[in-house]
């Protein structure tokens, strides 16, 4: 049945999320005659590309074509052949490529050039590859979750089955955690957005939204870990780093050259008397938490209120969807339930981090050790970021919903990006016939 024209009149779109740690391809589908309705686009496939993020191919760009092949071939199978030529393909690269561009614009261009060459060889309507801004990443994530939750229209079919009991018309805030950056986006209540860089105005489906957004580059979970290691090794007395964010008994050798490869560790760079150092885990949540807090500079704020590093943050308002690594990490730790209080999460993290590494390896034998070893840090980092970074409290924690998918579509920026680029979010509430519309982000 593959590659046969479908009887119903449907359209497809493809978005590749070129993240810092990996690339994922998403295929979306919608009824052609309902392009302007809210909630009609849904994800039919996610294909995770095998290998690291595209920024890691900087010294081996000729391998990018092969790297993308499997998922692009999967798209060829899923989408009927008759639809190939009219199916748009977009690639958005996020913070991993932002960091590479900071190091060298020429190297970032080289990677994107080969990505564009490779993707344009497929029979789809390739629309280009680009590094999206942190502001776009936050905005499109916010659009995605609110579109899927039916927040942009009274006509939605989802309210009866979306498991979040909330005031129907209040939008959700979006909390996105990646490997290299993290985004916070929400509509503040009657609050002036004091920093123009953090203000977005949308008119969607006949309603105006004044949205706050910020992307913290270098504060994704992987780059935050590199930052923490670079900070801690500065004051180590020798090449042994006793690290409370890793399980007791865990050992790992780190190359100093790898530590200082990223622009995120530049502020901690120091000439060290060794080329390698050894991490020895001690598994102490409280100490790990304290070490992480040193990454957040809260001593300076030129606004009425800040998150950290002098970045304006209005008072938190309403419910929040926390997705991407917020969800994956908390899901692994079994802490995504709405019923788990912040105190309970902290207590569980303390227990988890204190478990010996050998015990952890046995309990989670199917999980790659590289990932498994970092859940203690990642979980602690999530708590630190949400509580001290963004000022959630034990009470407002109840308003954080850890979301992987909504109605079968992944929460993340890709759907919002495609909706915008295909002009499928009208400014005004659609009538029975589709209206003309333009781009909003």
């Amino acid at each position: 049945t593959q590659n046969k024209a479908l009887p119903e009149n449907v359209k497809y779109g493809i978005v590749l999320d070129a993240g810092s740690s990996h690339t994922s391809l998403y295929i979306y589908k919608w009824p052609a005659e309902k392009e302007n309705d809210t909630g009609v686009v849904h994800q039919v496939e996610e294909c995770r590309v095998k290998g690291p993020g595209i920024s890691k191919f900087v010294q081996k760009v000729n391998e990018i074509g092969i790297y993308l092949t499997d998922c692009m071939e999967r798209a060829r199978e899923v989408i009927p052949r008759s639809q190939h030529q009219e199916t748009p393909v977009y690639l958005g690269a996020t913070a991993g490529m932002r960091l590479l561009r900071m190091e060298s614009e020429e190297l970032a261009d080289r990677v994107l050039d080969v990505v564009e060459r490779s993707l344009s060889n497929y029979p789809f309507d390739f629309q280009g590859a680009r590094i999206i801004t942190g502001q776009e990443e936050g905005a499109y994530g916010w659009i995605t979750i609110n579109y899927l939750l039916g927040k942009f229209s009274q006509k939605t079919r989802w309210f009866s089955i979306v498991p979040y009991e909330t005031n129907n018309q209040e939008t959700f805030g979006a909390l996105d955690l990646g490997g290299a950056s993290t985004q916070v986006t929400f509509v503040p209540q009657n609050q002036t957005i004091e920093s123009p860089d953090n203000a977005l105005q949308f008119r969607l489906y006949g309603k105006d939204y004044n949205v706050y957004t910020h992307s913290f580059l270098c504060y994704g979970k992987d780059q935050a870990l590199w930052q923490k290691l670079a900070k801690d090794i500065q004051v180590a007395s020798n090449e042994i780093l006793r690290d409370p964010c890793f399980h007791p008994g865990y050992k790992k050798v780190v190359n100093v050259s790898d530590l200082y490869k990223t622009p995120c560790t530049k502020r901690f760079e120091k000439k060290l008397p060794f080329d390698q150092f050894r991490i020895q885990g001690t598994g102490d949540y409280e100490q790990c938490h304290q070490s992480i807090l040193e990454l957040f500079n809260t001593s300076y704020c030129p606004y009425s209120q800040c998150a950290f590093n002098g970045i304006f943050l209005p008072p938190l308002q309403g419910d929040f969807g926390a997705f991407s690594a917020f969800y994956f990490v908390m899901k692994f730790l079994n802490l995504t339930s709405e019923k788990v209080s912040q105190e309970k999460v902290t207590e569980m993290m303390k227990k988890f981090c204190a478990q010996p590494w050998e015990e952890i390896k046995t309990s989670y034998a199917g999980v790659k050790e590289k990932y498994l070893s970092e859940y203690c840090f990642s979980g602690t980092y999530i708590l630190s970021l949400l509580l001290q970074g963004y000022h959630f409290t034990a009470d407002s924690w109840e308003h954080i919903h850890f979301i992987g998918k909504i109605q079968g579509s992944d929460a993340g920026w890709t759907l919002g990006y495609m909706l915008n680029l295909t002009n499928m979010i009208p400014a005004e509430q659609p009538l029975s016939t589709p209206l003309s519309h333009s781009t909003y982000v």
């Epitope: 050039d113 060459r117 344009s120 801004t133």
Partner: antibody, heavy 120, light 113 residues
């Protein structure tokens, strides 16, 4: 100053293949995206494909019939067109640039052109 | 792919007069990341390869006389020769390098009236 020097004119039979070379001098070849453009007699310019950083790509019209390669050791790019027909009679040019990222200034250096005549 | 449409097909202008060539793309070639239009203009004289005149829609390539100027954004572009000289007799092509496949306009032949 980069220069592109192409191989000489060719006369080919229908169904055969032709391989045109384009040698670069005076620049770092590995960082040059090279495009191939053809021009039939009295007609306009038509982009066939290009290569940059080891990866080639082709216009849909020529997919499966054209192969673009590059040999960094000799700073030479090649364009091979197979299953030739009379409509392939044209001047074939190589040019530096054309890619959005690596060739952001357009095609700024051109070879002198290679005339390929396909005739039985 | 993006279709490039040039007008007019040919143009006869007196020496010293202004020549204007239009180019329209079937979709925008303005790249939001850097606010640049990925459009170039070329001049081709008989028996010669094309020569780059303008890139990024309005930036003159090195050595190009300032009587040549490019303007426009998004989908509509113009090449202007402010004061036509005898050596400007040629065919002029616009080309987008925003998306693969790269595409050229059909060309505009400029002659002296």
């Amino acid at each position: 100053q980069v220069q592109l020097v192409q191989s000489g004119a060719e006369v080919k039979k229908p169904g055969s293949s032709v391989k045109v070379s384009c040698k670069a001098s005076g620049g770092t070849f590995s960082s040059l995206p090279i495009s191939w453009v053809r021009q039939a007699p009295g007609q306009g310019l038509e982009w066939m494909g290009g290569i940059g950083f080891g990866t080639a790509n082709y216009a849909q019209k020529f997919q499966g019939r054209v192969t673009i390669t590059a040999d960094e050791s000799t700073s030479t790019a090649y364009m091979e067109l197979s299953s030739l027909r009379s409509e392939d009679t044209a001047v074939y040019y190589c040019a530096r640039g054309g890619a959005k990222y690596a060739g952001r200034y357009g095609m700024d250096v051109w070879g002198q052109g290679t005339t390929v005549t396909v005739s039985s | 792919g993006i279709v490039m449409t040039q007008s007019p097909d040919s143009l006869a202008v007196s020496l010293g007069e202004r020549a204007t060539i239009n180019c329209k793309s079937s979709q925008s070639v303005l790249f939001s990341s850097n606010n640049k239009n990925y459009l170039a203009w070329y001049q081709q004289k008989p028996g010669q390869p094309p020569k780059l005149l303008i890139y990024w829609a309005s930036t003159r390539a090195s050595g190009v006389p300032d009587r040549f100027s490019g303007s426009g954004s998004g989908t509509d572009f113009t090449l202007t020769i402010s004061s036509l000289q005898a050596e400007d007799v040629a065919v002029y092509y616009c080309q987008q390098y925003y998306l693969y496949p790269l595409t050229f306009g059909g060309g505009t032949k400029v002659e002296i009236k």
